[in-house]
Each structure stands twice: as C-alpha cells, then as structure tokens.
Interface confidence: low
C-alpha cells in the first residue's frame, strides 16, 4: 500500500492569505489570516461592505486593502486617534490672514471669506468691496447707494409710495373717500393763505348807503369776512369774526368805533348776516334779528361829485390797512358765504367771476377740523425748549386724525441743514386695509405701531412724548416707552438737532432730499394737532399751502350726499 503524500506540500493555500495549512487524509485545510476567506484563503474580505459593520465603522471614507481596510478623511479634515473618526480642520485659526480684511468663516472641510450684505469679496485684493446696486437698476424711481446697501425711494410729493417689494413705486391710494363736491354759488373765503379773495368797486348815486347781506358758514373763530372803504381810503368798515362772534370796526372823519356782539356763529351752520347803514346808525342782524346797533354822526362814506364810490374786499384787506385797525386781527378766515347782496345790487357780476374759478368754490358739506388735501404743508416755528424742565427740550404731541389716504407725513421737524430729526408718518400696512404709524429720526424708523384701522369715519387719537432720554408712545392698547439705551444714537441725533433751530411742518415735508426720511408723501385727510398743550391753529402758521383748510374738513363720501342746507356738524373723535 502506497503512503498518501502530504497534502500541504506543495502549498495549496494562497500565500498572502493563509496562516497555516493542515494535512489530512487526502485533503488539506487552510486556516486564513484575518481579512481573508475561501478554501485556500484566496478571497480578500471587503470590510467596507460588511453588513454588520457598515463602512467599516469609518466616519467618512473606508478604503479596502488586501486582507485589511483603513479609514481616511475628506480634504479639510484630520483623522482622530481612534483611526475611525474625522475632525474638521479650522483653516481660519491655522492661517489667520487668509481672508485679508474680510471675515474668515470656517465651514466643514473648508473656509469662506465673508463680506457683510451689500459687499462682495475681491480675491485679488483680499478685501470686501461695496456692490453698487443702483448701477443694476434695482429701483423704479430713485436709488441711493450707500456702503453695504441701497434704498429705493419714490416721489411721495407726486403721490407715489414704495411698493411691498421695496423697489417699485405705486400710487398712494384713497382709503376713505371724501365728499369734495363744491358749488360756485358758495364763495370760499380762504382761497389765499394771505390776500383778498375777491375785490369789488361800486359807483352808485350819492343817496346810496352801505349795505351787505349774506349767508355765512364757518368753524373758524377769527378772521375778516368783508372790508369796505372809500375811494380815498379816508373811511373804512371792517366786518370780521372774533371769538366766534361778529365784530365791526369802523373809521371815518367823524368817528372811530369797534363793537362785538351777537351769538357765537362759528358753529358750522349757515347764518344769515346783514350789515346796513341807516341814517344815524349801522344795524347788524343775524337771522334777521338785530344784534348790534352802532351809532354814527354822519354818513359812513362821503359821496363826491354826486357819486358814492366804495371798494369792497372779501376775506381780507389791503396790506396798509393793518396798521390802521383799531384792534389788530388775523385776517385769515376759513369760511363760506352765499346769497350775498352788496350795496343792494344783488349778486350780479360776482357769480360770473366766481363760476370760472374752481378754487373760489366752497365745499357743500364740511365738518369741524383741519383738512390736508395731500398737496402741501403748513409751517410753524415752535420753541420746544422749556427752561423750567430739567430735561431741556420736550415734545408732547396729540394727533387726532382721520386719514383719507393711508400714506403720508403727518408731522415733521426739519433742521436748517435740511435733515429731518423727527417725523411721524402714516404708511399703508402690509395687512389689508390697515395702516402703520411710523416714527423716524432722519431716515431711520425708530418705532412702528402696526396694523391700525385708521381710515374710518371715526377719528383716531395718538399721543407721544419725546425728550432726550426717551420716547413715550401712547395708543389705547398700551403705553410704549423706548428708552435711550435702545435708541441712544437716534435720540442723540434728535437732541443735537433740538439744540439748534428746527421748523415744525404739518402735512408733509418741505424740499428735503428723498432720502431724508422713510416717508415723503404729503398727508391727505383731516388732522388736529396739539403740541406742548397748545392746539395749533393753521391760521397762525408761518406759511400754509392754499389748499389746506384750516378750520373745515370735508365729510366722508356717502352715496346720498347731504345738501348744503342739511349740514349736521359732527365730530367723531377719540377725545
């Protein structure tokens, strides 16, 4: 019997993968090294695909090798001592000047050179450079580029506002339609902020005496209704309103008198007024009832050459007269007259003159208040410095508003250098049919009261107080006090401006750059303003746009409009 040879010789096992070979009866057994398998240890085990140890337990890359494997890391990572996990390399710490003047930001496996918004990183200069967005035509109307950004502006004075996309412009729309119907039979006495509204000259037989009859409607308490004088200016008669009552001043060669009397007639209703020169007196009647009788020694105006020549001025008087008045008066009067009959000559000739001139026509229905039509401003010079107040200057403002358009500047303080250190504006809210009240210092919004329903029949009430330390905002839901810590920079800007000269504007802004404020549209609607306890009277303004009505506010438009004889003066107010 032949002996069975050693099955392990020659070696049947894979030399790389075997650990030992065991001879058996006509057979052999290869014992494999770790990482190998197969009868002859000829197959490498791919540990990276081991279902019981996925990816070989590597956190990033698993590299299979014959009989083994190892973990490796992606670029920008280093292997930890456990040979499995990878850790991010912080390139910004390793090379601090990597980004030059930009900010180095470490990101997993890499780094970025970051610039603030509105800047772009320049690889060559290793610095951040401003992006000129205006050169990219980002804005519909006006674009102002500044380091790191840009702002689009729309011409508010032409009735535009910035759209929600902050780039395009849209027309400021009416949110509360008003009844702006006028009648040429109603003469508007406040057509001019300064000056006479109508001038007439009468040449009548010498037996004539002065007489004037008219219906009169106003909420104003003071102003000139009518002034009459002789051709040589030697005699004159003034019919005015003071404290809501009729006042008569007269002067001629015989006498010089001033009389006030009758009921208060600045009630917004039509009052019939007549002034008639009798033989020995001047009779003043309201609603056909005598309220004053002024004695006079002779005729009011002296006839010459068989004629009585008289000049009559409505709503004012010639400038030189001012110094001659017995008692000075602010001539501005926001009121209307109708059914006039001067010197017993009826209305002939006058109606024809007025009919052609729309701005001489009066609104059919009005309410108490001041109306800003969205085309101009009123300017006041107010001293906000209070010597007795330890805080120095202070601004306490109460606004009663009934806007007709949802965007516009209600109140602004303007410095001599054309900056706007403080403004209170209205802007249409992102919420449908509501408005925000925005308070700004220069072109920064420092506070916003959001989503108020201000375009309604009722007036809305807003109060705020400002001094160099804080801004206190008072709306019916809450009081908001914003202190200097939060607004240090803005209140410091305001404080500096208040130490110089500031003009107060109502209803909008004068000619300042678009970029001076966040809002530049004129306010459209009714508004009463009280500053530091004083109700501002637009008749007392330094200047006022002719279209602003100082003491009358159009009624809210209704489908069936009241006739002028049904005026029911209303004041729906937050007060």
């Amino acid at each position: 019997v032949n002996a069975i040879p050693d099955q392990c010789s020659p070696l049947p096992c894979n030399e790389d993968g075997y650990m030992s070979c065991k001879d058996g009866k006509a057979s052999f057994t290869c014992t494999c090294k770790p990482g190998w398998q197969g009868e002859k240890c000829e197959f490498d085990i791919n540990e990276c695909k081991d279902p019981s140890n996925i990816n070989g337990g590597c956190s990033q890359i698993c590299d299979n090798t014959p009989g083994s494997y190892h973990c490796s890391c992606k670029s920008g990572f280093v292997m930890l001592s456990n040979k499995k996990d990878c850790k991010d390399v912080d390139e910004c710490s390793l090379k601090p000047n990597m980004c030059g003047t930009a900010v180095c930001k470490n990101i997993p496996g890499d780094f970025e050179c970051e610039c603030p918004e509105g800047y772009r990183y320049n690889l060559k200069s290793k610095s951040c450079e401003d992006v000129d967005e205006c050169s990219e035509n980002m804005c519909a109307q006006l674009c102002v580029n500044y380091p790191g950004g840009y702002t689009c502006y729309c011409d508010g004075k032409k009735g535009f506002k910035l759209a929600q996309d902050q780039k395009s412009c849209e027309a400021v729309s009416v949110c509360l339609p008003l009844n702006l119907d006028t009648k040429y039979e109603l003469l508007y006495l406040a057509e001019q902020f300064a000056g006479v509204v109508l001038y007439l000259k009468f040449r009548l037989p010498e037996i004539s005496r002065f007489s004037a009859e008219f219906d009169f409607r106003t909420y104003d308490s003071q102003g000139v209704i009518l002034y009459a004088e002789s051709i040589d200016h030697s005699a004159w008669l003034l019919i005015a309103l003071r404290g809501g009552k009729i006042e008569v001043q007269l002067k001629n060669e015989h006498t010089s008198k001033i009389t006030t009397g009758g009921d208060i007639i600045n009630n917004g209703l039509w009052n019939m007024v007549s002034v008639e020169e009798l033989e020995h007196s001047i009779s003043i009647k309201i609603a056909k009832e005598a309220v004053m009788d002024i004695n006079k020694p002779g005729p009011l105006f002296k006839p010459e050459n068989g004629l009585l020549e008289t000049k009559v001025y409505f709503a004012g008087f010639p400038r030189k007269v001012e110094s001659e008045l017995i008692k000075p008066i602010n001539p501005r009067l926001d009121g209307c007259i109708r059914s006039w009959n001067l010197m017993k000559q009826g209305a002939s000739g006058i109606k024809e003159i007025i009919q052609e001139k729309q701005n001489k026509h009066c609104l059919v229905t009005v309410e108490k208040g001041s109306y800003y039509p969205g085309s101009g401003i009123a300017e006041f010079h107010i001293d906000y410095n209070n010597g007795s107040n330890a805080e120095g200057w202070h601004i306490n403002v109460t606004l009663n508003i009934r806007p007709s358009m949802g965007t516009g500047v209600m109140l602004a303080l303007v410095s001599s250098n054309n900056t706007v250190p403080f403004a209170v504006s209205l802007v249409d809210s992102t919420s449908e049919k509501s408005q925000d009240i925005v308070i700004s210092v220069e072109n920064t919004v420092i506070y916003r009261i959001q989503a108020l329903s201000l375009c309604s029949n009722q007036r809305s009430h807003l109060e705020f107080r400002v001094n160099r330390n804080n801004l206190e905002l008072l709306t019916p839901l809450k009081i908001e006090t914003i202190s200097q810590e939060e607004l240090q920079t803005q209140l410091a800007i305001l404080d500096k401006a208040m130490k110089g000269k500031v003009a107060t504007y109502l209803g909008g802004l004068p000619d300042v750059p678009f970029s001076a404020t966040p809002v530049n549209a004129f306010y459209n609607g009714c508004m009463e303003v009280n500053i530091n306890g004083v109700e501002l009277d637009l008749d007392e303004a330094i200047s006022k746009h002719n279209d602003i009505r100082a003491h009358s506010c159009p009624s809210v438009w209704k489908k069936t409009k009241n006739s002028e004889d049904q005026v029911d003066p209303r004041l729906i107010d937050g007060k």
Epitope: T398, E432, A451, S453, Q458, L474, L477, I479
Partner: antibody
C-alpha cells in the same frame, strides 16, 4: 401689584345717572389707559371707553351721548357716569388697566 | 362695529380632553385678537394676546392660532380649573368688541 376696586350704588332708578368710582393702588393713573367694561346678564361684554394718562377720553359711539369718564389724580381714582339709564343698563361694571389688570366688578341693577 | 361670533356657545367636556374654541370676525382684523377666561364670580383674565402670544403665568396648555377672520383657542388636556367662560376680543378698530363667549362645562 396693580389693584383696582369698583365702588358705587348697586341700585339705580331709570332715567337717573349711574356713577361709579374705580380706586387704583400699585400704579398711578397718570400713566396707562384706564377702561370701563360692562357685562350684561346674558354674558355679553361691552367696551365702554377709557381715560388716558393725559386725561383724554374715548367713548364707545353707542354710549357717546350718555357717558362721561373723569378722574382725580390726587386720589388716584377714575370715575364713570352714565346718564339717563334704563333697565338695559343693568350689568356688572368692571374697571381695568389696559386689559391685563381688572377690578372684581360691581353689579348695578337699574330698576324702579 | 366689528362683530365677533364665538362657537360653540357651550362645550361639554371631560377633564383630560383637548378642545378648540372658535372665534370668527365679521371682517379682517389682522392679528389683533385676544382671548380671556372668566370663571364664575371672577373678573376676566387675559390668556392670549395678538392671536398666539402667551401671557406670563398662563399654563402652556393654552394656545392660539388663526389670522384674518378665523381664530382658534386650543386647550390641550383640559383640567378642572379650566371650566368657565371664554371670550375673544378685537382691538383692530374702535370700538373694541367682544365675542358672545363660549361656556366650557364639565360633561
């Protein structure tokens, strides 16, 4: 802590004036908004009006011709007056600072 | 005036249940809606303001949602102390108005 306490007659005759006082402790009525609200027997709540820190007032238009809210800062109290009352004005009357702090309410019955 | 309609008028629940109370406005009131709780013989208590802003001291089981005209007050797992009246109130435009209330009672 802010506390409010309503006081006044619990019975008022029709056509007379309902007068209530709200006494405030823990806060000054010269800051904030001070309200009157009433709750009718059927659980309906009605906002009546406010007087502000500065003394300005707002009245619910449905009551405007009859309501008056005044204050006395030296006593830290504010007041409600409702004229020409009818049985419809029977309610629990609450005073409140904004709407966070409320008095416990006082029931006023209008009856002959 | 803006009318707020609350539903249901009465809600009978078992402690531990979760409930939703509805308040609907007659016109859009943005986010100017607030919720109050009033227990018997107590004054109303502000629970949530501006739809979903929580008030300090109010348990986190009370939450609010909604916008425009439809709003919801949710109570997650009602507790016995939660039974009483719930009112919504709008401050979007004057005069401020309240809903008619929902009575939450034990089943």
């Amino acid at each position: 802590e802010v506390q409010l306490q309503e006081s006044g007659p619990s019975l008022v005759k029709p056509s007379q004036t309902l007068s209530l006082t709200c006494s405030v402790t823990g806060d000054s009525i010269t800051s904030g908004y001070w309200n009157w609200i009433r709750k009718f027997p059927g659980n309906k709540l009605e906002y009546m009006g406010y007087i502000s820190f500065s003394g300005s007032t707002y009245y619910n238009p449905s009551l405007k011709s009859r309501i008056s809210i005044t204050r006395d800062t030296s006593k830290n109290q504010y007041y409600l007056q409702l004229n020409s009352v009818t049985t419809e004005d029977t309610a629990t009357y609450y005073c409140a600072r904004e709407f966070a702090y409320w008095g416990q309410g006082t029931l006023v019955t209008v009856s002959a | 005036d803006i009318v707020l309609t609350q539903s249901p008028a009465t809600l009978s629940v078992t402690p531990g249940d979760s409930v939703s109370l509805s308040c609907r406005a007659s016109q859009s009131i943005s986010n100017n809606l607030h919720w109050y709780q009033q227990k018997s013989h107590e004054s109303p208590r502000l629970l949530i303001k501006f739809v979903s802003q929580s008030i300090s001291g109010i348990p986190s089981r009370f939450s609010g949602s909604g916008s425009g005209t439809d709003f919801t007050l949710s109570i997650n797992s009602v507790e016995t102390e939660d039974f009483g009246m719930y009112f919504c109130q709008q401050s979007n435009s004057w005069p401020w108005t309240f809903g008619g209330g929902t009575k939450l009672e034990i089943k």
